[in-house]
Amino acid sequence: MAVTACQGLGFVVSLIGIAGIIAATCMDQWSTQDLYNNPVTAVFNYQGLWRSCVRESSGFTECRGYFTLLGLPAMLQAVRALMIVGIVLGAIGLLVSIFALKCIRIGSMEDSAKANMTLTSGIMFIVSGLCAIAGVSVFANMLVTNFWMSTANMYTGMGGMVQTVQTRYTFGAALFVGWVAGGLTLIGGVMMCIACRGLAPEETNYKAVSYHASGHSVAYKPGGFKASTGFGSNTKNKKIYDGGARTEDEVQSYPSKHDYV
């Protein structure tokens, strides 16, 4: 039960995280005009990964896409790449994890296969989350650097007569969405990896059957495992387990009339 819960929760958390990464990538507010200690203007600027926008006090908003690829800063391209890689890995991870879910039965898929798929999706979620966190952090670092550079020469005088106000940009909402979403995807991935450990049987949990041969009893364990002789310890038809107490989830289940596909 605990493994199913951990796997299901990991899937849901990752799903929310990836949705957040997609939302952050699409958002226009990666950087917003810094209003603190700035002359009050009737125009508000904000920028995303794909376009920059200007919202006038009159209520009209105009957005312009970055219709160049080569003219964009390398850092911005890197952030775009990291976010896209994060989304792609996350999407593949979601697809894999759907089939890996213990509550979903596909044909006669063994638990070992589900365990492998759970681990794969978990790793994908972890990498996806790290990509998003890295992308957002690179952008944030870029903003901080530019902020202090523009603060240093905020007012560039023209002959001491005319002043040009330089627009400074600070963290936009998308950065926080990205950090939280990346973190959730990472946590979801870790949960999937933990669930995988519970799904993977260390030894196959078949019940052992004792056969009483003439002279001495030998308990046979089906499945190619070493048979144990019954001298001494296990002569009274005891069930042989592969060691240690196990949860309900870890005992292999078989389809019954109550199972739903």
Epitope: A42, Q47, E56
Partner: antibody, heavy 117, light 113 residues
Framework: QVQLKESGPGLVAPSQSLSITCTVS????????VSWVRQPPGKGLECLGV???????NYNSALMSRLSISKDKSKSQVFLKMNSLQTDDTAMYYC???????????WGQGTSVTVSS | DIVMTQSPSSLTVTAGEKVTMSCKSS????????????LTWYQQRPGQPPKLLIY???TRESGVPDRFTGSGSGTDFTLTISSVQAEDLAVYFC?????????FGSGTKLETK
């Protein structure tokens, strides 16, 4: 079509307050801002303040302490209230719609206000 | 507050003549986000409210004759009337619509000889 019409008292005694109403039609106050501008006789234009679509306001710094702009969206009316009037507040008072580029594209015909005892 | 300086204060012209008037702001009205200068031009005929001619320093308002052209960026702006008509005799005001409070220039009066 877009129309703005100012209505005021015409004559105001010094140190009294002024209230002007701008009634708009042809557009919604939830979508556009409205600005108040005045023009003393034979002089230039002076922007008093703006009330934006969202309800936030910006005032002329020199008049901020005695100026108040509000609106009633349901009645499509914008109000200008000015306290402690002096003779130099005598002017033609206009209301105008704020459009693209924060420009004032439609103006009312104005209401003349004379501050005199 | 932003100071808007218009020159000349008055211009005497004849019909068909090309006219240029200037407007300077004490701070740049150029917005880096969209590379637009937030300056507007208005025409005010005697006894009438102002009429919008140009916004974003160079965008002509619909219905305004194409003889009116706005140019300039940052702090220096120009309004040009390519061929003055009798109905163009009015006062022309420039306005800063970038910084609060919005401020007007003192105006340029266009007069006939």
């Amino acid at each position: 079509q877009v129309q703005l019409k100012e209505s005021g008292p015409g004559l105001v005694a010094p140190s009294q307050s002024l209230s002007i109403t701008c009634t708009v039609s042809g557009f919604s106050l939830t979508s556009y801002g409205v600005s108040w501008v005045r023009q003393p006789p034979g002089k230039g234009l002076e922007c008093l303040g703006v009330i934006w679509a969202g309800g936030n306001t910006n005032y002329n710094s020199a008049l901020m302490s005695r100026l108040s702009i509000s609106k009633d969206k349901s009645k499509s009316q914008v109000f200008l209230k000015m306290n402690s009037l002096q003779t130099d507040d005598t002017a033609m008072y206009y209301c105008a719609r704020v459009y693209y580029g924060n420009a004032m594209d439609y103006w009312g015909q104005g209401t003349s206000v004379t501050v005199s005892s | 507050d932003i100071v808007m300086t218009q020159s000349p204060s008055s211009l005497t012209v004849t019909a068909g003549e090309k006219v240029t008037m200037s407007c300077k702001s004490s701070q740049s009205l150029l917005n880096s986000g969209n590379q637009k200068s937030y300056l507007t031009w208005y025409q005010q005929r005697p006894g009438q409210p102002p009429k919008l001619l140009i916004y974003w320093a160079s965008t002509r308002e619909s219905g305004v004759p194409d003889r009116f052209t706005g140019s300039g960026s940052g702090t220096d702006f120009t309004l040009t009337i390519s061929s003055v008509q009798a109905e163009d005799l009015a006062v022309y005001f420039c306005q800063n619509v970038y910084f609060f409070p919005f401020t007007f220039g003192s105006g340029t009066k266009l007069e006939t000889k």
